[in-house]
């Protein structure tokens, strides 16, 4: 693995991707969709020290700053670097219409 | 001010854009960038309650299952939308090199 | 725009195997919640659900004649495909593929005639 | 299997008239019912979902009700167009399960 992919703090604690499993009333979903009625939600999750899976310069310039004046300026934060898309079953004042979200559930991770 | 862009913690409280004045030492960038001395960092800071400049729909997700599961699952978190590009001017192995970076200075925020 | 359309050999003989396509458009099969149905008609048994496949590889088979069927699929050229071994008269049907989200057939091709004919 | 039965085979109507397709499922299947309408030489058309759902583009004409085991598809001020075979179809459980179809005569 890279630098940027091995995880200082152990196993796991790093910025990943992480799978909850939740129904359509925990996404305060269940007015609005009618299927599916369960989703295996992806999302990153984890810490971001120095160095990993930094998304670009602004991450560095964060971290860096971070270190100086941690009580001004945040460490960088563990978002999606992509996304997969998902469609969902949508109930309409006339019926159902089906949706594709591409912004939806995560694919990968990184630190900003 | 839309309803995602009126902070219920307070002015300033919620995910915004932050200026840090920084030098070339604090970004530890003095032994390979000439010019800017010191840069003015834009940078995205502050809390994301619900929908506070949510992004998508991801971090509208996020933000109901951090509410049933706090432990689990963070609330999203303030990251640049977009970014302004800057130059700087490098050193190089036969002189100066002028280089954009177009992910330095973030631009306006959201929450991811 | 959703469109599939069903491509088999029209005509074998008994104890062969059909090769069926179904090459579609206007959807991805990388999209969460995607899937393509094979379904066939007869007139002597109406509509029969054969097979599916979802987006993440999960497929699902009639019980009734899973030991002769295998689907599978090319995500990046858009087409899914059914194998059914050892034909017989009984498989003499039109055969359709329909675009499955999640529990939803909503869209279906214009289907292919086939014939087990010895 | 999940046994779903459509009594009647064939049904008459007149333009303007309203019809009731009925279906009956052998054991209780929710709202996991579909409705889908057939006309000559024509593949399936989707026409209903969770048995009281009209997909977008469907007239509202056609309107689905039920659950459990008892299904209904009605199509109230009948068009010439309507003429066609209607199927219902259960997907609550493996294997999924079409009923025989009703054939819509129109007068």
């Known amino acids: 693995a890279r630098n940027g992919d091995r995880c200082p703090l152990g196993p796991g604690r790093c910025c990943r991707l992480h799978t909850v499993h939740a129904s359509l009333e925990d996404l305060g979903w269940a007015d609005w969709v009618l299927s599916p009625r369960e989703v295996q939600v992806t999302m990153c999750i984890g810490a971001c020290p120095s160095q990993f899976r930094e998304a670009n310069m602004h991450a560095q310039i964060k971290m860096n700053l971070h270190r100086l004046k941690p009580d001004t300026v945040p460490a960088p934060c563990c978002v999606p670097a992509s996304y997969n898309p998902m469609v969902l079953i949508q109930k309409t004042d006339t019926g159902v219409s089906l949706q594709t979200y591409d912004d939806l559930l995560a694919k990968d991770c990184h630190c900003v | 001010a839309r309803n995602g862009d009126r902070c219920p913690l307070g002015p300033g409280r919620c995910c915004r854009l932050h200026t840090v004045h920084a030098s070339l030492e604090d970004l530890g960038w003095a032994d390979w960038v000439l010019s800017p001395r010191e840069v003015q960092v834009t940078m995205c800071i502050g809390a994301c309650p619900s929908q506070f400049r949510e992004a998508n729909m991801h971090a509208q997700i996020k933000m109901n299952l951090h509410r049933l599961k706090p432990d689990t699952v963070p609330a999203p978190c303030c990251v640049p939308a977009s970014y302004n590009p800057m130059v700087l001017i490098q050193k190089t192995d036969t002189g100066v090199s002028l280089q954009t970076y177009d992910d330095l200075l973030a631009k306006d925020c959201h929450c991811v | 725009q959703v469109t599939l359309k069903e491509s088999g050999p029209g005509i074998l003989q008994p104890s062969q195997t059909l090769s069926l396509t179904c090459s579609f458009s206007g959807f991805s099969l990388t999209t969460s919640g995607m899937g393509v149905d094979w379904i066939r008609q007869s007139s002597g048994k109406g509509l029969e659900w054969l097979a599916h496949i979802y987006w993440d590889d999960d497929k699902r088979y009639n019980p009734s004649l899973k030991s002769r069927l295998t689907i599978s699929k090319d995500t990046s050229s858009n087409q899914v495909f059914l194998k059914i071994t050892s034909v017989d008269t009984a498989d003499t049907a039109t055969y359709y593929c329909?675009?499955?989200?999640?529990?939803?057939?909503?869209?279906w091709g214009q289907g292919t005639s086939f014939t087990v004919s010895s | 299997d999940i046994v779903m039965t459509q009594a009647q085979k064939f049904m008459s109507t007149s333009v303007g008239d309203r019809v009731s397709v009925t279906c009956k499922a052998r054991?209780?299947?929710?709202?996991?019912v579909a409705w889908y309408q057939q006309k000559p030489g024509q593949s399936p058309k989707a026409l209903i979902y969770s048995a009281s759902y009209r997909y977008s583009g469907v007239p509202d004409r056609f309107t689905g009700s039920g659950s459990g085991t008892d299904f209904t598809l009605t199509i109230s001020n009948v068009q010439s167009e309507d003429l066609a075979e209607y199927f219902c179809?259960?997907?609550?459980?493996?294997?999924?399960?079409f009923g025989g179809g009703t054939k819509l005569e129109i007068k």
């Open positions: 054991q209780n299947v929710g709202t996991n």
């Open positions: 179809q259960q997907y609550n459980s493996y294997p999924y399960t």
């Open positions: 329909a675009r499955r989200a999640w529990d939803a057939m909503d869209y």
